[in-house]
């Protein structure tokens, strides 16, 4: 029983939450809260929006983003892409891991220009020590953050 | 190997399924089937719609609800909120953990009055012994529960 | 620590990805890539679209499918069903495990007839040795595969 408990306590896991500072508008990935409220890191590191593996292995990684808007201004993309991407020293570019495309503006109608939609991604990927995972949303202007419960990012070793 | 198998057998996990009795109409959380069919509890308890932790630690909690309706009698502006909430003796009110908002009525078209949508939530949260997690949907009458495969609620320790 | 690492290395897990050959049009389940790119099998087998358990226990199984189309041709169902199903020698028919219904065509608008939607399923189920899990989508013609990051199927023991 001691062994089993120790195993759980050491198992890498993290849950990061959305915050006002998450949307940078710089073309970079979303940034996340790592300590306050529901957010935590256990056996994983965080750096500039990325979860960083300290231990090689397979991880279930996940992210949810809350999308919302008022109608669909022409300046905004009618397709929203939400993805988890890997950064590794072995490649110069980010590697797509898990991606979703949605057309949420179809939910805005003549009667109701306000719309809400949610995108969830989760899957098992292999990470080497030092490899990073980030979340990107295009167009990030449609991400609604509020209080950390609607948009988040996490992982745990399986 | 014996140690590893024992570890899995003891790891808290649960999967609860929707049933005809899930919608109380009382303003409380959804209720769930805990034994029949695909439903089970292993190292977690159940009480009035809540999964109750018997062991402190980080849990991946998840819920899916199948939403559906015929047209949009409440108006196309209607927003459905699906959330996982924590009950703890340390606070008088439920704490939001993971929440989604959707505007599914935008899916009803002139070609199709009947619409279906699905909301999935999952994330890692910390639970102390005795703390509870419940699922709420507003408006719960738009949740399809009948067969247990379309709306469900579960957790496992990570 | 050696014990803990061994436990992780032996823990059954898999992540299978969509490929050009995934959609058979034969009425069978979706087929998956098991080795290339992000795909892997560890302690689970694969057979004709199915993940096959080598070890009895509870598994978190998941699947995401990327849906997309141009408008809603009358020949296509306005409701799309995405499900995970169990095959077992104990029953002649597949057993529904986790299912979603969506009406994505409502996302096509006057501004943009092209629509995208995504369906994610995940939950804990019990598998005996030799039992299989498959993914089905009706109408599969609306599944968009591309590169393995948008439609996928996986599992790990909990």
């Amino acid at each position: 029983l001691i062994q089993e408990r120790r195993s759980h306590q050491n198992n890498p896991a993290a849950h990061l939450t959305g915050a006002n500072s998450s949307l940078t508008g710089s073309g970079g990935p979303l940034l996340w809260e790592t300590q306050l409220g529901l957010a935590f890191l256990r056996g994983l590191d965080y750096h500039d929006g990325a979860l960083v593996a300290n231990k090689a292995g397979y991880y279930y990684i996940y992210s949810k983003v809350q999308l919302g808007g008022v109608g669909c201004p022409l300046g905004l993309a009618s397709t929203i892409t939400h993805g988890l991407y890997k950064r590794t020293p072995r490649y110069p570019e980010e590697l797509e891991l898990l991606v979703s495309q949605q057309s949420p503006c179809g939910r805005a109608t003549s009667n109701s220009r306000v719309w809400w939609d949610s995108s969830f991604l989760g899957g098992v990927v292999h990470l080497e020590v030092g490899e990073e995972v980030v979340v990107r949303v295009l167009d990030e202007r449609l991400v609604r953050l509020r209080d950390g419960t609607r948009s988040y990012f996490g992982a745990f070793m399986v | 190997l014996i140690q590893e198998r024992r570890s899995h057998q003891n790891n808290p996990a649960a999967h609860l399924t929707g049933a005809n009795s899930s919608l109380t109409g009382s303003g409380g959380p959804l209720l769930w089937e805990t034994q029949l069919g695909l439903a089970f509890l292993r190292g977690l308890d159940y009480h009035d719609g809540a999964l109750v932790a018997n062991k402190a630690g980080y849990y991946y909690i998840y819920s899916k609800v199948q939403l559906g309706g015929v047209g949009c009698p409440l108006g196309l502006a209607s927003t459905i909120t699906h959330g996982l909430y924590k009950r703890t003796p340390r606070y008088p009110e439920e704490l939001e953990l993971l929440v989604s908002q959707q505007s599914p009525c935008g899916r009803a078209t002139s070609n199709s009055r009947v619409w279906w949508d699905s909301s999935f939530l999952g994330g890692v949260v910390h639970l102390e012994v005795g703390e509870e997690v419940v699922v709420r949907v507003l408006d719960e009458r738009l949740v399809r529960l009948r067969d247990g495969t379309r709306s469900y609620f579960g957790a496992f320790m990570v | 620590l050696i014990q803990e690492r061994r436990s992780h290395q032996n823990n059954p897990a898999a992540h299978l990805t969509g490929a050009n050959s995934s959609l058979t049009g034969s009425g069978g389940p979706l087929l998956w890539e098991t080795q290339l790119g992000l795909a892997f099998l560890r302690g689970l087998d694969y057979h004709d679209g199915a993940l096959v358990a080598n070890k009895a226990g509870y598994y978190y199984i998941y699947s995401k499918v990327q849906l997309g189309g141009v408008g809603c041709p009358l020949g296509l169902a306005s409701t799309i069903t995405h499900g995970l199903y169990k095959r077992t020698p104990r029953y002649p028919e597949e057993l529904e495990l986790l299912v979603s219904q969506q009406s994505p065509c409502g996302r096509a608008t006057s501004n943009s007839r092209v629509w995208w939607d995504s369906s994610f399923l995940g939950g804990v189920v019990h598998l005996e040795v030799g039992e299989e899990v498959v993914v089905r989508v009706l109408d599969e013609r609306l599944v968009r595969l591309r590169d393995g990051t948008r439609s996928y199927f996986g599992a790990f023991m909990v």
Epitope: - | L67, G68, G69, V70, G71, S112, V114, R144, L145 | A77
Partner: antibody
């Protein structure tokens, strides 16, 4: 248990306006339902006229749309139908019906007994 | 508008018989189909919704099947109270439409 009861004049003159009311008892009109009107000419089949929700959203049969108005009176827990410019072809038994619009249960499960309307001078 | 064609338009059967009525839609309606029973001077009564779901309180002798364009209502063992007119109805798209009806008579 919800019950519906139609009321209104049984005789309407050609080119006049047919006005019917459906009283809802045993439940609130402010629920996730569509409140429908369906008619049945003598010896013939059923024809859907239209629907209204408690929030006043309406959908009408295109074949009648230019002549139909439906509304809801939440205070009185009733809904109504107005059909103008009537002719003999509008002679029928008029039913009000509740259609459930929730996720688990669909269908027009509650009907009024029907009221016969004759268009004649 | 979606047209629903019922067949047969009428049929004669005896108590205890198994009877099948079909309804064909002019385009796909998924499972958004209901079946009603109507007796003279009475309003229609909902029997089946969502193509195959039995309405509460309705005898299990009634069953529905089908999806897309072809649907069936089956009465497994006719009882005296089953002789009536049966209508299918699609609620998938506007306008809601009904089949022309099938009159079930005693042989």
């Amino acid at each position: 248990q919800v019950q519906l009861q139609e009321s209104g004049p049984g005789l309407v003159k050609p080119s006049g306006t047919l006005s019917l009311t459906c009283a809802v008892s045993g439940g609130s009109i402010s629920s996730i339902n569509w409140w429908n009107w369906v008619r049945q000419p003598p010896g013939k089949g059923l024809e859907w006229i239209g629907e209204v929700s408690h929030s006043g959203i309406t959908n009408y049969n295109p074949s009648l749309k230019s002549r139909v108005t439906m509304s809801v009176d939440k205070a009185k827990n009733q809904f109504s139908l107005k059909l103008n410019s009537v002719t003999a072809a509008d002679t029928a038994v008029y039913y009000c019906a509740r259609e459930r619009a929730v996720a688990d249960y669909h269908g027009m499960d509650v009907w009024g007994q029907g009221t016969t309307v004759t268009v004649s001078s | 508008a979606i047209q629903l064609t019922q067949s047969p338009s009428s049929l004669s059967a005896s108590v205890g018989d198994r009877v099948t009525i079909t309804c064909r839609a002019s385009q796909g309606i998924s499972s958004a189909l209901a079946w009603f029973q109507q007796k003279p001077g009475k309003p229609p009564k909902l029997l089946i919704f969502d193509a195959s779901d039995l309405e509460s309180g309705v005898s299990s002798r009634f069953s529905g099947s089908g999806s897309g364009t072809d649907f069936t209502l089956t009465i497994s063992s006719l009882q005296p109270g089953d002789f009536a007119t049966y209508y299918c109805q699609q609620f998938n798209s506007y306008p809601i439409t009904f089949g022309q009806g099938t009159r079930l008579e005693i042989k």
